[in-house]
């Protein structure tokens, strides 16, 4: 089948070749930083990825075997010779952006380990995809009226019902532990993050562990890049100054044909610090054109609440590789310097592996002082990764995308 991903163990055939598009809580990851048990599903089969022992209550695991002892293979095995996460990423195919459910929920993609979840604070949080259900029972999800998990807490906090959507790398880097609401029903909180598609199909390794992706990287896919979300140490004063910066022109995504219309409602109103993120499944499937639809994102510095209402960004089926191009968008908050170096929001026509399990989104948030602002994805490479240094909106979108993958256990 698909050629084994380089990094993976004999991932025989196509194992690594699948584009993760449309993943939904199929088993994706969502890292809740503080959340105990944030599963770093994103950590792909890191050698260190010791499966959480079943006995430990695993978030979302309705039934965890008490007996499974990580085998040397599982724990120490370089998970399929997956080199460093970055390596894997490179090997992985662009996975499509989840359309709605998180990979974890769907049971596809990396399998987050509860342990990872526990390691939730791991700065480099890999995308831990948690099933919407939190990888657990289906019915435990806390959902909005529409049944979709909604996240209204600052990213740092994983709302209870939030199942980490596929690889919702919601690794609030040390944001003041927002009320960590454990993923409801043990399922990894879905943060709606969908950026890294590490589909839950493969349990991710513990977040703190070496994060070599356990997923075989699809040989055919472009390498995924580790999205390092670096949040510069924020001091209250600096945060303020940033908030005051002039609105950063958002890339014009008008041409995004697909269902992405959802960015239209994003309003970034930095200010108070409340981040209200309402995630609806991001259906990015058909963002064929080169993203041009951030056109309606309103960045209203000042205000206070960041209310991001993402409706399904339909990246679903094929935001294939054009994503590579958020790479240069750098939002440099600070006296108004906003550099948008290249807005090519080109969502690669099938940002396949990049989002879910391709780009491992590493959130490095240096000393965050009381800052609950959304973490920024950085370096989500062209393989579908979104390289957003400080663009909360983009980060949010990415998050949503990843989150949706987790559901399906992919």
């Amino acid at each position: 089948m698909a050629e084994p991903r380089q990094e993976f163990e004999v991932m025989e055939d196509h194992a690594g070749t699948y584009g993760l598009g449309d993943r939904k809580d199929q088993g994706g990851y969502t890292m809740h930083q503080d959340q105990e048990g944030d599963t770093d599903a994103g950590l792909k089969e890191s050698p260190l990825q010791t499966p959480t022992e079943d006995g430990s209550e695993e978030p979302g695991s309705e039934t965890s075997d008490a007996k499974s002892t990580p085998t040397a293979e599982d724990v120490t095995a370089p998970l399929v010779d997956e080199g460093a996460p970055g390596k894997q990423a490179a090997a992985q195919p662009h996975t499509e952006i989840p359309e709605g459910t998180t990979a974890e929920e769907a049971g596809i993609g990396d399998t987050p380990s509860l342990e990872d979840e526990a390691a939730g604070h791991v700065t480099q949080a890999r995308m831990v995809s948690k099933s919407k259900d939190g990888t657990g029972s289906d019915d435990k999800k806390a959902k909005g009226a529409d049944g979709k998990t909604k996240i209204a807490t600052p990213r740092g906090a994983a709302p209870p019902g939030q199942k980490g959507q596929a690889n919702a790398t919601r690794i609030p880097a040390k944001t003041p532990p927002a009320p960590k609401t454990p993923p409801s029903s043990g399922e990894p909180p879905k943060s709606g993050d969908r950026s890294g598609y590490s589909s839950p199909g493969s349990p991710g390794t513990p977040g703190s562990r070496s994060r070599t992706p356990s997923l075989p990287t699809p040989p055919t896919r472009e390498p995924k890049k580790v999205a390092v979300v670096r949040t510069p140490p924020k001091s209250p004063s600096s945060a303020k100054s940033r908030l005051q910066t002039a609105p950063v022109p958002m890339p014009d995504l008008k041409n995004v044909k697909s269902k992405i219309g959802s960015t239209e409602n994003l309003k970034h109103q930095p200010g108070g610090g409340k981040v209200q993120i309402v995630y609806k499944p991001v259906d990015l499937s058909k963002v064929t054109s080169k993203c041009g639809s951030l056109g309606n994102i309103h960045h209203k510095p000042g205000g206070g609440q960041v209310e991001v209402k993402s409706e399904k960004l339909d990246f679903k089926d094929r935001v294939q590789s054009k994503i590579g191009s958020l790479d240069n968008i750098t939002h440099v908050p600070g006296g108004g310097n906003k550099k948008i170096e290249t807005h090519k929001l080109t969502f690669r026509e099938n940002a396949k592996a990049k989002t879910d399990h391709g780009a491992e989104i590493v959130y490095k948030s240096p000393v965050v002082s009381g800052d609950t602002s959304p973490r920024h994805l950085s370096n989500v490479s062209s393989t579908g990764s979104i390289d957003m240094v400080d663009s909360p909106q983009l980060a949010t979108l990415a998050d949503e995308v990843s989150a949706s993958l987790a559901k399906q256990g992919l």
Partner: antibody, heavy 117, light 108 residues
Framework: QVNLRESGAEVKKPGASVKVSCKVS????????MHWVRQAPGQGLEWMGW????????KYAQKFQGRVTMTRDTSITTAYMELSSLRSDDTAVYYC????????????WGQGTLVTV | YVLTQPPSASGTPGQRVTISCSGG????????VSWYQQLPGTAPKLLIF???QRPSGVPDRFSGSKSGTSAPLAISGLQSEDESDYYC???????????FGGGTKVTV
Amino acid sequence: QVNLRESGAEVKKPGASVKVSCKVSGYTFTGYYMHWVRQAPGQGLEWMGWINSNSGATKYAQKFQGRVTMTRDTSITTAYMELSSLRSDDTAVYYCARGARDGYGFDYWGQGTLVTV
Amino acid sequence: YVLTQPPSASGTPGQRVTISCSGGSSNIGSNAVSWYQQLPGTAPKLLIFTNDQRPSGVPDRFSGSKSGTSAPLAISGLQSEDESDYYCATWDDSLNGWVFGGGTKVTV
């Protein structure tokens, strides 16, 4: 090479339970979700649920909630599916299938275990 | 079945056959589709994943696509060995689980 090997056929009486195993080899067991899908004679495929092989977390189809239990033993890279309170309509071939990591689908399947009630 | 497929389809060698798979906004409309081929007496085999991706080893005669809430599978240059049952599957947001089509038996 990736291989999912399931346990042998089972014949059970109504009300009993059956536990099917799926021994995995050729890849890092904990790196993938394991799904269980069944197929009644002459019928189509029906998804039962999945287990995160790494954490043990599970997700079951509503239809099977309360009757199915999926577990795994990472030390022997084996996933298990136990179905209780068996009824005649549970007679089917039960498959374990690995959730794709980089795509949307089930990339590898076990050969199936026929359970006759 | 949540996803609807025609029970059967047939064609002669060399022909092109298309199998439809229709669903709704909560499944195909918002999630990627995968296709499986199940030869008599064997386990299903992944044929198409993520709407239109072919695992290595699958002939390019098989192609998948997705438009709205429908995801057809096309088999061009039909061959005798293609005689099999084909199933489409995707995640359903409402049911919160994977759903399959009822299967289509292709006869060559």
